[in-house]
């Protein structure tokens, strides 16, 4: 029996004969911009842009069902036009057009905002683009804008605005010695400005021998006034002279003196925590310093909070190392020797691609990243020794590691 007439839209047919008898063959080629869809028994076999397919009449049926569907370019995205939103009322197939609008605060540059779906399934090259602009930068607290043009509302990506911190403020991260006050912010790709900030200049804390004896109006920040109340009323060294003022350059305008009534010496430090040793070559007078050290050579002297002992230091706690205590004018040791403990020091070879259990704590920078897959250089954690448990002492504990980015990090905030 003959096959029915072969009719394929958007295609050209080339048949072996005009008859549709058993064994007759036709080659189907889709027009440019259309894709061959080949089915057998209503099941899609393949979709191809390639040149043609041959169908054969077999027992009154064509052995394949063929259609030519328009190429689909799919909805355009930022790869076509950055910072734009697209509208495609005609769909996204061959020949159809989409228009785009620039998302605020980007602005259209050029006048043809249409894209056409091309025969190869790609969108036509845009003849316009969205130029991202930044609005006027927001005010930075305690800073003055130095660039006049930056008060306007249109700024190209990459352009800079210069600021200067007000007296008594400086750029964070710059040391008090360098006191950097000027900084620039840049208009970024997403139409926002890089953040800039000015933080108050601070003075160094007064010498530790005065610890606990002074009151300050605003900590050690610029303009703060710190005072020690003396009982003596000697005119040359009276009440007024034991006041110091933090200047805008980060230095004090003077220095404290020891009040006349502050005499004597600190008691001999005893009842030290285990392994701790104090050496006091200058005795125990006010201002005398005792060097702290640990009897075990590979331990370090550190300060722990009152209620924490060496045995129960959580891994996220990064205790402060301490190298000396000083006898204050209040005849107390600072820091108090009872708070000083000896903790096992870090082993060498942090960041060497071996996870050393002893270093897997904040105090040792989590072994330089060696215990987390996301931070170890080889991207594979190798415990050392091999018996170290990857769920136990050699587990990924670093709260900064990617492994913890979606977990509940309460309790890590101390570290």
């Amino acid at each position: 029996t003959d096959c029915p007439e072969l009719a394929v839209e958007n295609a050209s047919l080339n048949c072996s004969s005009s008859d549709r008898y058993h064994g007759a063959q036709c080659t189907v080629s889709c027009r440019t911009g259309y894709v061959l869809q080949i089915r057998r028994d209503d099941e899609l076999i393949k979709s191809q842009t390639g040149p043609s397919v041959t169908v054969t009449c077999t027992e009154g049926k064509w052995n394949k069902q063929v259609a030519c569907e328009p190429v689909d370019c799919s909805i355009p995205d930022h790869h076509q036009v950055y910072a734009a939103s697209f509208s495609c009322p005609e769909g996204t197939t061959f020949g159809s057009q989409c228009s785009f609008q620039c998302r605020h605060p980007a602005q259209l540059k050029g006048n043809n905002s249409l894209l056409t779906c091309m025969e190869d399934g790609l969108w036509s090259f845009p003849e316009a683009l969205c130029e991202l602009m930044c609005l006027a930068p927001p005010p930075v607290p305690n800073a003055d804008l130095q660039t006049a043009r930056c008060r306007e509302n249109k700024h190209k990506v990459g352009s800079f605005c210069k600021y200067k911190c007000k007296p008594g403020y400086h750029v964070p991260g710059s040391s008090r010695k360098s006191k950097k006050r000027a900084f620039k912010t840049q208009c970024t790709q997403d139409g926002s400005w890089q953040e800039g900030a000015c933080v108050p200049v601070t003075c160094d804390p007064p010498p530790p021998k005065f610890h606990g004896l002074y009151q300050c109006t605003n900590g050690f920040q610029f303009n703060s006034e710190c005072r020690i109340k003396c009982e003596d009323s000697d005119a040359s060294q009276g009440l007024g002279s034991n006041v110091i003022h933090c200047r805008k350059d980060g230095t004090w305008n003077g220095s404290f003196h020891v009040c006349q009534e502050m005499q004597g010496q600190c008691s001999v430090p005893n009842e030290l925590n285990s392994n701790l040793k104090l050496q006091c070559p200058d005795g125990y007078a006010i201002g005398s310093e005792c060097a702290t050290s640990c009897l075990d050579h590979n331990s370090e002297s550190i300060i722990l909070p009152m209620n924490v002992t060496v045995r129960d230091i959580p891994h996220w706690l990064n205790p402060t190392r301490v190298e000396r205590v000083v006898c204050t004018a209040g005849l107390k040791w600072y820091p108090h020797p009872a708070l000083i403990h000896c903790v096992k020091g870090c082993e060498p070879f942090m960041g060497d691609n071996y996870c050393d259990a002893i270093n897997n704590r904040a105090f040792c920078n989590y072994d330089g990243g060696d215990c987390c897959t996301s931070t170890v250089k080889t991207k594979k954690v190798t415990p050392f020794p091999m018996s170290c448990d990857l769920q136990g002492d050699c587990a990924c504990r670093d709260p900064q590691a990617q492994e913890h980015s979606r977990k509940d990090l309460r309790g890590y905030s101390h570290g």
Epitope: N298, C346, E347, F349, M350, G351, G368
Partner: antibody, heavy 118, light 107 residues
Framework: EVQLLESGGGLVQPGGSLRLSCAAS????????MSWVRQAPGKGLEWVSA????????YYADSVKGRFTISRDNSKNTLYLQMNSLRAEDTAVYYC???????????WGQGTLVTVSS | DIQMTQSPSSLSASVGDRVTITCRAS??????LNWYQQKPGKAPKLLIY???ILQSGVPSRFSGSGSGTDFTLTISSLQPEDFATYYC?????????FGGGTKVEIK
């Protein structure tokens, strides 16, 4: 008194070999990692190699990897550096250093000069 | 590898001056930074470890500060015996690397 004393330096031709030794005294040698640091004439310090306390984990700078071998004999309180395939750029004073805790070189030897020249 | 950049490479100062040397790491090294002093013909000597801790026996005129990538060694009042070359060294990860050195000379 804590002391490190290097020996074994000298003049050697390019391609030649040399073995440096470092004798330790005044501390428990087996309780510390040890290291070699070198300094070319008129130049800065360059870390060369290190070895852990007892299990013998070894580390090398890329510039010497495959040519130098660090080792230790805890029974003799001695650190070694076997240097093969020596090059002119290996000319330097070689210091032996004790590694304390999370890596600081707290005790240094006086250094031994290695000159590689034809 | 972590690169360490010291500045300045040399400086001239007088006795009594306050001297500041900076060291910058190519990536964050937390506080794993040490400072050494070296005099001509001598071995280096450890001054400061973990960025700010003074090694035992080192005068308190030496101080260190910083964390992350930027570090500072300060000599509050330069003494005649302080004229030397100073090196920073990172111990955050192997290979351990030194800065190029800063030579402090007499003005």
């Amino acid at each position: 008194e804590v002391q490190l004393l290097e020996s074994g330096g000298g003049l050697v031709q390019p391609g030649g070999s040399l073995r440096l030794s470092c004798a330790a005294s005044g501390f428990t040698f087996s309780s510390y990692a040890m290291s070699w640091v070198r300094q070319a004439p008129g130049k800065g310090l360059e870390w060369v190699s290190a070895i852990s306390m007892t299990v013998g984990r070894t580390y090398y700078a890329d510039s010497v990897k495959g040519r130098f071998t660090i080792s230790r004999d805890n029974s003799k309180n001695t650190l070694y550096l076997q240097m093969n395939s020596l090059r002119a750029e290996d000319t330097a004073v070689y210091y032996c250093a004790r590694v304390w805790g999370g890596v600081r070189f707290d005790v240094w030897g006086q250094g031994t000069l290695v000159t590689v020249s034809s | 590898d972590i690169q360490m950049t010291q500045s300045p490479s040399s400086l001239s100062a007088s006795v009594g001056d306050r001297v500041t040397i900076t060291c910058r790491a190519s990536q964050s090294i937390s506080t794993y930074l040490n400072w050494y002093q070296q005099k001509p013909g001598k071995a280096p000597k450890l001054l400061i470890y973990v960025a700010s801790i003074l090694q035992s026996g080192v005068p308190s005129r030496f101080s260190g500060s910083g964390s992350g990538t930027d570090f500072t060694l300060t000599i509050s009042s330069l003494q005649p015996e302080d004229f030397a070359t100073y090196y920073c060294q990172q111990s955050s990860s192997t290979p351990w690397t030194f800065g190029g050195g800063t030579k402090v000379e007499i003005k």
